[in-house]
């Protein structure tokens, strides 16, 4: 194993990869420890502020972790001659916050990418497709690590941070041989509809601590190949039957569903039958109810359609008529608010006029006032019509 | 020098157990994708499990439940536990590691050890 | 269940002949697929993976191509040291598989 540290500085590498000149094939950068038998380049927690350019061309496993790159710009990774056999990435906890289209291209045989505990509050749509064409070269990723990557809330762009990132996997269809996908920890509200539809080939998919409320709009019935489904620690509350079905009809998936608050009423009648008759939940004896409160820590697997039942609610014609009353009020409000908005200048002119009486009818207390107040006056009130 | 070495190699009966260690020097262990391939004399090779650097374990249909492979990353040694051995187990294994690291997925082995002789007969 | 099948079994040849040697996968494989020499007495060195990537300090003779279910192995002009075996090894799963390995193909000197 050779290792080489910066012997003038410790300042952060700096080099610009423009300017470099091709790498010797077994130069290994400051700051960097390069092992040609493991073919591996180790530049952690080194505060790198920019991607070394003088990486050997050896190099398969490339840890730039615990560094400070801040911005991943397009083609950061682009040599010449290009590193054609790095084929694992790891650049997690580099405090990057942007990456940029194109930033992972010419790199032929990179198939693992951990971008995880990066607070990315930029991720273009182009950063895995590298071009914005509809259907881009496909990319050689095969396992992509993304978990974490949410930035703080004052970070935050004005968009969907989870648009956001189902932009990137779809952009070009370019992630269709994807078969690891990591989204763990990133305070998902939803998974945007289109997603799993562009990412056939995923094998393992985890979304464990996310804050995923429902499944009700997201597919899972091209995933055929899916052997591993992480849904532990979300905001499930109950699973609807043709989401039920989708993963029966899954010849290979386990799904884990730990943790997650399960509301035990009669919507939940479906999900206890499928449980109890399904091979498919791992752990499925662990789950248990977080509501109604009667409920609590209940095993879901050991309730009977008795023991789910919903508040009386009112019967379903009723329901109906009292929509339509909602709606009808609802719409004379608005017409009566439109009739004010129309005849506004009547009405400020009204407003005036009463305005004016108010002041005369208050001058007329006041007058009315000062006689009662003076004694000499006071026979005159009874008489007073003002 | 990057190198694997298997050792645990041996003469057992049918029906006993045998543990086979292969020790890795000049590389971590932990981060790669390590499997064992066996090879009957005068035979093709045969893969029967990996281990991925997230701990996944895949298995041969035929060593499920007999071959239990495990990671010892402290003693940066690979195990490979066999029970209820058969004659047709008698083989050279092979302890292999792909240069790629991998949580998950595929193994191509670009690094291979000397293999040590495993012979089950009564 | 996938399947390596290779062909042929074994093959003859001369020093300076071009050799092909191809590998079918019972079902589609992508272009997770490797290529290793063995020769007698010696643990298998990897020559090719990922259908095409030749690996470090493999001669520039040998090449593979395929994707798919249809792989090949070339080597442009034999050499006396290239007469051995030769297996292909699929990558794509290793769930519910009897082998990833290809059956091999023997190259002896004509």
């Known amino acids: 194993t050779s290792s080489a540290s910066s012997s003038s500085s410790s300042a952060p590498f700096l080099a610009s990869a423009a300017s470099a000149q091709p790498p010797l094939p077994d130069q290994c950068p400051a700051l960097c420890e390069c092992s040609e038998a493991a073919r591996t380049v180790k530049c952690v927690n080194r505060n790198l502020t920019e991607v070394p350019t003088d990486l050997p061309l050896y190099v398969r496993n490339l840890f730039l972790t615990g560094n400070q790159l801040a911005v991943l710009p397009a083609g950061a990774f682009a040599r010449r001659p290009p590193l054609a056999e790095l084929a694992a990435l790891n650049l997690s906890g580099s405090r990057l916050d942007e990456v940029r289209g194109g930033a992972f291209e010419h790199l032929p045989s990179l198939r693992q990418l951990d971008l995880s505990h990066n607070p990315l509050a930029y991720l273009s749509p182009f950063a895995f497709s590298g071009s914005n064409a509809s259907i881009s070269a496909p990319s050689p990723l095969v396992e992509l690590i993304l978990n974490h990557i949410v930035p703080p809330d004052d970070k935050r762009q004005n968009r969907s941070f989870e648009g956001m990132v189902a932009a990137a996997l779809v952009a070009g269809r370019a992630l269709q041989g994807l078969h690891l996908l990591e989204l763990a920890s990133n305070h998902f509200l939803y998974l945007p509809r289109d997603v799993l539809a562009q990412l056939p080939s995923l094998r393992y998919l985890d979304l464990s601590n996310n804050s995923l409320v429902s499944l009700t709009y997201v597919s899972f019935r091209n995933l055929t190949h899916l052997e591993s489904l992480h849904l532990e620690d979300n905001a499930l509350k109950v699973l609807h039957n043709g989401t039920l079905a989708e993963l029966q009809g899954l010849p290979h998936v386990r799904v884990f569903l730990d943790n997650n608050p399960w509301v035990c009423d009669c919507h939940m009648a479906d999900m206890v039958t499928w449980l109890k008759q399904t091979g498919v939940v791992q752990g499925k004896d662990r789950l248990t109810c977080a509501f109604p409160e009667k409920m609590r820590n209940r095993v879901l697997l050991e309730l009977n359609s008795a023991d789910l039942d919903c508040d009386p609610i009112l019967p379903p014609s009723l329901q109906t008529s009292y929509v339509f009353l909602g709606i009808v009020l609802a719409l004379i409000g608005a017409i009566f608010l439109l009739v004010l908005y129309l005849n506004r200048k009547g009405i400020k002119k009204w407003m005036h006029n009463i305005r004016d009486a108010c002041r005369d009818h208050m001058e007329g207390y006041h007058y009315r006032y000062e006689i009662n107040a003076d004694p000499r006056l006071t026979n005159l009130s009874s008489n007073s019509d003002v | 020098e990057v190198q694997l070495e298997e050792s645990g190699g041996g003469l057992v009966k049918p029906g006993g157990s045998l543990r086979l260690s292969c020790a890795a020097s000049?590389?971590?262990?932990?981060?790669?994708?390590v499997g064992w391939v066996r090879q009957a004399c005068g035979k093709g090779l045969e893969w029967v499990s990996i281990i991925y650097g997230s701990g996944r374990t895949y298995y041969a249909n035929w060593a499920k439940g007999r071959f239990t492979i495990s990671r010892d990353n402290s003693k940066n040694t690979l195990y490979l536990q066999m029970n209820s051995l058969r004659a047709e187990d008698t083989a050279v294994y092979y302890c292999a590691r792909d240069a790629s690291v991998s949580v998950y997925y595929w193994g191509y082995f670009d690094l291979w050890g000397r293999g040590t002789l495993v012979t089950v007969s009564s | 269940d996938i399947q390596m099948t290779q062909s042929p079994s074994t093959l003859s040849a001369s020093v300076g002949d071009r050799v092909t040697i191809t590998c079918q996968a019972s079902?589609?494989?992508?272009?997770?697929l490797a290529w290793y020499q063995q020769k007698p007495g010696k643990a298998p060195k990897l020559l090719i993976y990922?259908?095409?990537t030749l690996e470090s300090g493999v001669p520039s003779r040998f090449s593979g191509s395929g994707s798919g279910t249809e792989f090949t192995l070339t080597i442009s002009s034999l050499q006396p040291d290239d007469f051995a075996t030769y297996y292909c090894?699929?990558?794509?799963?290793?769930?519910?598989?009897?082998?990833?390995f290809g059956q091999g193909t023997k190259v002896e000197i004509k």
């Open positions: 079902q589609s494989i992508g272009s997770e």
């Open positions: 090894q699929q990558g794509y799963t290793y769930s519910e598989i009897d082998n990833a």
């Open positions: 990922r259908a095409s």
């Open positions: 000049g590389i971590d262990l932990s981060h790669y994708v």
